[in-house]
């Protein structure tokens, strides 16, 4: 395990990573739920969207999110070719023209309407820390992940590799 300095080290270069190409390598329409099987839902209220984490009633339809996957080249820190590897970044769009954004000042996750090219706040580095779960790390704030706090999505600072496995930053993607 890395310890605190290790997490900072492996995420530090996120700021410098460049997304290769402006079009996603693939897209995937899925419902998003927490590790504990609560659904992430989106509701239009007063001309803006709110994001909720809630238990759905039986047979209630889950909201779908379009995940767009982008390759991002990572600057080298030990290999001679200038590129150390590739990261997978995603954007999440529950409805046309709206994307999840990281608001790092407020430590919140918000839905913003915007045009392409999308701002960096809309990109999240995809992690697997569990066989069938994913985590979303802010491109703009390495070490900060989308998580669940008080039945809402929030930005949660992860300060050691052990905490990468905490349930509140783990999400399940499902086609149903």
């Amino acid at each position: 395990a890395f310890g605190i300095s290790g997490v900072q080290k492996y995420t530090r270069a996120l700021h410098d990573s460049s997304i290769t190409g402006i079009s996603p390598i693939t897209e995937y329409l899925a419902s998003l739920s927490t590790y504990n099987d609560q659904s992430i839902t989106f509701a239009l209220e007063d001309e803006s969207y709110e994001i909720y984490v809630e238990d759905l009633k039986k047979d209630e339809k889950k909201d779908k999110v379009l995940l767009s996957y982008y390759e991002s080249q990572h600057p080298s820190n030990e290999s001679g070719d200038g590129v150390d590897g590739k990261m997978l970044m995603v954007t999440l769009s529950p409805t046309k023209d709206f994307w999840l954004h990281a608001n790092n000042k407020e430590h919140s996750v918000e839905l913003h309407k915007c045009e392409k090219p999308l701002p960096d706040q809309a990109f999240f580095v995809l992690h697997n820390m569990h066989s069938n779960c994913v985590s979303f790390e802010c491109k703009t704030d390495p070490g900060v992940f989308i998580g669940v706090k008080d039945n809402h999505l929030a930005l949660i600072k992860v300060d050691s590799s052990e905490n990468l496995c905490t349930e509140n930053i783990l999400f399940k993607l499902s086609e149903t």
Partner: antibody
């Protein structure tokens, strides 16, 4: 240049254990999931398990669960696969592989070790 | 577990011909599907990932397509070095699984 160099061939008796090593170089070892795949003589490919980039999680198929253990040593950039209670059907070439992307398992396995033949015979 | 069924088991073709290999999944999944080529005595080589992305260094005569449960690897014009065994593999759901393979042999 990415390299995965595995330990040499092993001959074991049924009931014994074997530990195969895979030394990685040419990339940031701490950022990648590592996976083991085996191939019995004349047969197809079988997933043997994966270990997360931090080493904090391991995942194995039911077919070998309880007999296989994967570990990684960040100080030497080496991943290990130990298989116990060996039987004749474990005779295979064992490959270590590296994931395509930092931090996750998406996108297949672009890098493979040269393979380690493990023969189980009495 | 997702079972991947490859067909045909053997494909007999001549150099210059087009090869179409199928991989059928027992259930739908995101397109985390990869294709590998393996020659005797060698480790598998990644050709295609994300169902249709060409891996670096792989010739453009290889292409992948499909989604859901039905995936295809196409070799537009077979070269002598393309005669080998081809495997599909899904990474979407654990356990990770491979197809049984398709052998492309010289007719």
């Amino acid at each position: 240049e990415v390299q995965l160099v595995q330990s040499g061939a092993e001959v074991k008796k049924p009931g014994a254990s074997v530990k195969v090593s895979c030394k990685a170089s040419g990339f940031t070892f701490n950022n990648y999931w590592m996976t083991w795949v085996r191939q019995a003589p004349g047969q197809g490919l079988e997933w043997m398990g994966s270990i997360t980039y931090t080493g904090g999680g391991t995942y194995y198929p039911d077919s070998v669960k309880g007999r296989v253990t994967m570990t990684r040593d960040t100080s030497t950039s080496t991943v290990y696969m130990e298989l116990s209670s060996l039987r004749s059907e474990d005779t295979a070439v064992y490959y270590c592989t590296r994931a395509n992307y930092y931090y996750n398992t998406y996108g297949g396995f672009p890098y493979w070790g040269q393979g380690t033949l493990v023969t189980v015979s009495s | 577990e997702i079972v991947l069924t490859q067909s045909p088991a053997t494909l007999s073709l001549s150099p210059g011909e087009r090869a179409t290999l199928s991989c059928l999944a027992s259930e739908g999944f995101s397109n985390d599907l990869a294709w590998y080529q393996q020659k005797p005595g060698q480790a598998p080589r990644l050709l295609i990932y994300a169902a249709s992305r060409l891996q670096d260094g792989i010739p453009a005569r290889f292409s992948g397509s499909g989604s859901g449960t039905d995936f295809t690897l196409t070799i537009s014009s077979l070269e002598p070095e393309d005669f080998a065994v081809y495997y599909c593999q899904q990474g979407s759901k654990y356990p990770l699984t491979f197809g049984g393979g398709t052998k492309v042999e010289i007719k």
